[in-house]
Amino acid sequence: GSTVPPMVNVTRSEASEGNITVTCRASGFYPWNITLSWRQDGVSLSHDTQQWGDVLPDGNGTYQTWVATRICQGEEQRFTCYMEHSGNHSTHPVPSGNSHHHHHHHH
């Protein structure tokens, strides 16, 4: 089939006092090959500090996955989710408060 870009959605939740868990979800993409990674200051975080979900079919002939990490509250502006899919890439910031952002990729 043809390439379908992912929808990327970043959310945050309180983990423990002073820390938050940020989760980056990519969904509705095809083919299944994707790179999803959290970055600090534009630098990819170490493997050990991130948790990844499997790339799974979502029932519509496309796929979904996620990556999460724990960060210090107040440092959110330093962190972005980086996505690469079929030659396109995008970065996605941590939303402020309890809101969330989602949008398709851009170059």
């Epitope: 990674s37 200051d41 534009g42 630098v43 990819s44 170490s46 493997h47 440092e75 330093r78 980086y82």
Partner: antibody, heavy 116, light 107 residues
Framework: VQLQESGPGLVKPSQSLSLTCNVT?????????WNWIRQFPGNKLEWIGY???????TYNPSLKSRVSITRDTSKNQFFLQLNSVTPEDTATYYC??????????WGLGTSVTVSS | DIQMTQTPSSLSASLGDRVTISCRAN??????LNWYQQKPDGAVKLLIY???RIHSGVPSRFSGSGSGTDYSLTIANLEQEDVATYFC?????????FGGGTKVEIK
């Protein structure tokens, strides 16, 4: 993207070393981390630290007590200051951009000798 | 700090030869391994990032592979312009560290 280091080639022991990295072709506030690395005689490379696009800094713990990286966003430059230098700080100093996994663009380097 | 051991420290090969340089970390670096080329004039260029991804503009004769603690850079058909020193770098565990370099010469 181009990076160019500049600064004095000779510094006296106990003084401070100050270098400038001039960046063209990309804004240092746009994204990524802007690094200083040094190469000692004999080729060993050591990462010194970086200033991120937000202005946050991260340093090598081995140098943290002596190093400061700052920037001038209006000139698209960032700076290295290394205090209390000794002859062991004699090296070629490079600036580089760290994009995601790797340092994808480097300056040509500037040689610094610490000697009285 | 993670120690990166590069072998050999130098090598001499004929034009057209296949050349392999190895880099070993003293702990798992989860594919966060990059290769750089430093020309005799001191200019440094990124060749390979994240173990096997080729940086834009790098000739396809360069390739990277590996996992865990052991990684390698291969030059498929050595050319005169490949005379340089090659460095590996791990980016998984701060502070980032480099190998000692491999000097490549032509026989």
């Amino acid at each position: 993207v181009q990076l160019q280091e500049s600064g004095p080639g000779l510094v006296k022991p106990s003084q401070s070393l100050s270098l400038t990295c001039n960046v063209t072709g990309y804004s240092i506030t746009g994204d990524y981390a802007w690094n200083w690395i040094r190469q000692f005689p004999g080729n060993k490379l050591e990462w010194i630290g970086y200033i991120g696009y937000t202005g946050s800094t991260t340093y090598n713990p081995s140098l943290k007590s002596r190093v400061s990286i700052t920037r001038d966003t209006s000139k698209n430059q960032f700076f290295l200051q290394l205090n209390s230098v000794t002859p062991e700080d004699t090296a070629t100093y490079y600036c580089a951009r760290w994009r995601n996994w790797a340092m994808d663009y480097w300056g040509l380097g500037t040689s610094v000798t610490v000697s009285s | 700090d993670i120690q990166m051991t590069q072998t050999p420290s130098s090598l001499s090969a004929s034009l057209g030869d296949r050349v392999t340089i190895s880099c070993r970390a003293n702990q798992d670096i989860s594919h966060y391994l990059n290769w750089y080329q430093q020309k005799p004039d001191g200019a440094v260029k990124l060749l390979i990032y994240y173990t096997s991804r080729i940086h834009s503009g790098v000739p396809s004769r360069f390739s990277g592979s590996g996992s865990g603690t052991d990684y390698s850079l291969t030059i498929a058909n050595l050319e005169q312009e490949d005379v340089a020193t090659y460095f590996c770098q791990q980016g998984n565990t701060p502070p980032t560290t480099f190998g000692g370099g491999t000097k490549v010469e032509i026989k």
